[in-house]
């Protein structure tokens, strides 16, 4: 049938965390910082006054198919997308007196995956090819985690999957799915 030439247009079996979009405004926690808090001045110890758990680290369900080349999972998988603000944004007055939000330069708390779960999926392929079994690693819970600049990148990139890794004796497939395409796909989850 000539399907070897199929463009690898698949949803990444697990997308990079950095490819998740910011949630739309209506999904943000309704709890907003009081603009008059601390008289408009930043607190001396921004993370001492409020427990980090008070800030919004949302777990949003996202349903998608696992695809690999021309093959698609028989059923979609549902995983969590971690979203939201961890830790207070600080308020500084600008030159003309209106408030301005900015992120603290101290410890960086991020809403990121906390636990993962493995799920076996069956990939159905064209041309009468036998179904393929794949194990995917899906986000099971989210948490506000304190990240230092030192381990920032390694934490955020900890998002691999057995299915995404090339198997022995097989050439790895090119990752044709762009971050932009993944973002569009994820935006529909909300």
């Amino acid at each position: 049938q000539g399907w070897q030439a199929f463009k690898n247009d698949a949803t990444e079996i697990i997308p990079e965390l950095g490819e998740y979009p910011e949630p739309p405004p209506e999904l943000e926690n309704n709890k907003t910082m009081n603009r008059a808090e601390n008289g408009g001045r930043p607190p001396h110890h921004p993370f001492e006054t409020k427990d980090v758990s008070e800030y919004s680290c949302r777990e949003l369900h996202f349903t998608r198919y696992v695809t690999d080349g021309p093959c698609r999972s028989a059923k979609p998988v549902t995983e969590l997308v971690c979203s939201g603000q961890c830790g207070p944004a600080r308020l500084l007055p600008n030159a003309i007196g209106r408030g301005k939000w900015w992120r603290p330069s101290g410890p960086d708390f991020r809403c990121i995956p906390d636990r993962y779960r493995a799920q076996r999926v069956q990939l159905l392929c064209p041309g009468g090819e036998a179904p393929r079994a794949r194990k995917v690693r899906l986000v099971a819970s989210c948490k506000c985690k304190r990240l230092t600049r030192f381990h920032n990148q390694s934490e955020l990139k900890d998002f691999g999957t057995e299915a995404a890794r090339p198997q022995k004796g097989r050439k790895p497939r090119p990752r044709a799915r762009s971050a932009k395409a993944n973002q569009a796909e994820l935006e529909n989850a909300y």
Epitope: W3, F6, K7, D9, T11, H61, T63, R64, Y65, T67, P70, C71, R72, A74, K75, P76, T78, L124, P126, G127, A184, E185, L186, E187, N188, A189
Partner: antibody, heavy 119, light 110 residues
Framework: CQSVEESGGRLVTPGTPLTLTCTVS????????MYWVRQAPGKGLEYIGF?????AVSYATWAKGRFTISRTSTTVDLKITSPTTEDTATYFC???????????????WGPGTLVTVSS | AYDMTQTPASVEVAVGGTVTIKCQAS??????LAWYQQKPGQPPKLLIY???TLASGVSSRFKGSGYGTQFTLTISGVECADAATYYC????????????FGGGTEVVVK
């Protein structure tokens, strides 16, 4: 005999929420994905969304926020949150052809239920 | 994303003739395509799934083919009962989708 049937369609005024119900017989809902599709008078088929489980629900981009799909052990509901005149259509409920595979042909379909939104 | 375009919008065919309906996907959908027949006042009826597999109880006069972005439904030995509107439906992706169905093709039998 496996069948699905929609109910709840009626004349409503704009902004009045309306819930349509799809009742199934001859098969277990837990084994299948269920879909909602609508068809405005004289127009084509328009996909609204589907439900696989309580957490696995997906909507067409235009339907997000306008519709809510939920299910019980024997029924699938479609809530039109704030109907407008553009939501006037026949609403169909359909099941996956094969319980093991979603979005792989819908069969059976219900006969449809007509929703008219008018002031 | 994954928009489905059907051509022609309407076609006339004589009894006994052959009619071909095309469906084009804006992005490759492998073989995840179904075809439906709908008559006025009735729900759609599944004809073909996975691009070329005939649904249960459907006449072998209906034939589906295609892969990737280009698909075809061919009806041979057309009968009066084939007068209907035909729709294609993609089954590859559920995210960022406006509609999984094509716009429909009306088949008029003379």
């Amino acid at each position: 005999c496996q069948s699905v049937e929609e109910s709840g369609g009626r004349l409503v005024t704009p902004g009045t929420p309306l819930t349509l119900t799809c009742t199934v017989s001859g098969f277990s809902l837990s084994s299948y994905s269920m879909y909602w599709v609508r068809q405005a008078p004289g127009k084509g088929l328009e996909y609204i969304g589907f439900i696989l489980s309580a957490t696995a629900v997906s909507y067409a981009t235009w339907a997000k926020g306008r519709f809510t799909i939920s299910r019980t052990s024997t029924t699938v509901d479609l809530k039109i949150t704030s109907p407008t005149t553009e939501d006037t259509a026949t609403y169909f409920c359909a099941r996956d052809r094969d319980g093991g595979t979603t979005l792989d042909g819908f069969d059976p379909w219900g006969p449809g239920t007509l929703v008219t939104v008018s002031s | 994303a994954y928009d489905m375009t059907q051509t022609p919008a309407s076609v006339e065919v004589a009894v006994g003739g052959t009619v071909t309906i095309k469906c084009q996907a804006s992005e490759s959908i492998s073989t995840w395509l179904a075809w439906y027949q709908q008559k006025p006042g009735q729900p759609p009826k599944l004809l073909i799934y996975r691009a070329s597999t005939l649904a249960s109880g459907v006449s072998s006069r209906f034939k589906g083919s295609g892969y990737g972005t280009q698909f075809t439904l061919t009806i041979s030995g057309v009968e009066c009962a084939d007068a209907a509107t035909y729709y294609c439906q993609q089954g590859w992706n559920i995210n960022n989708i406006d509609n999984i169905f094509g716009g429909g093709t009306e088949v008029v039998v003379k």
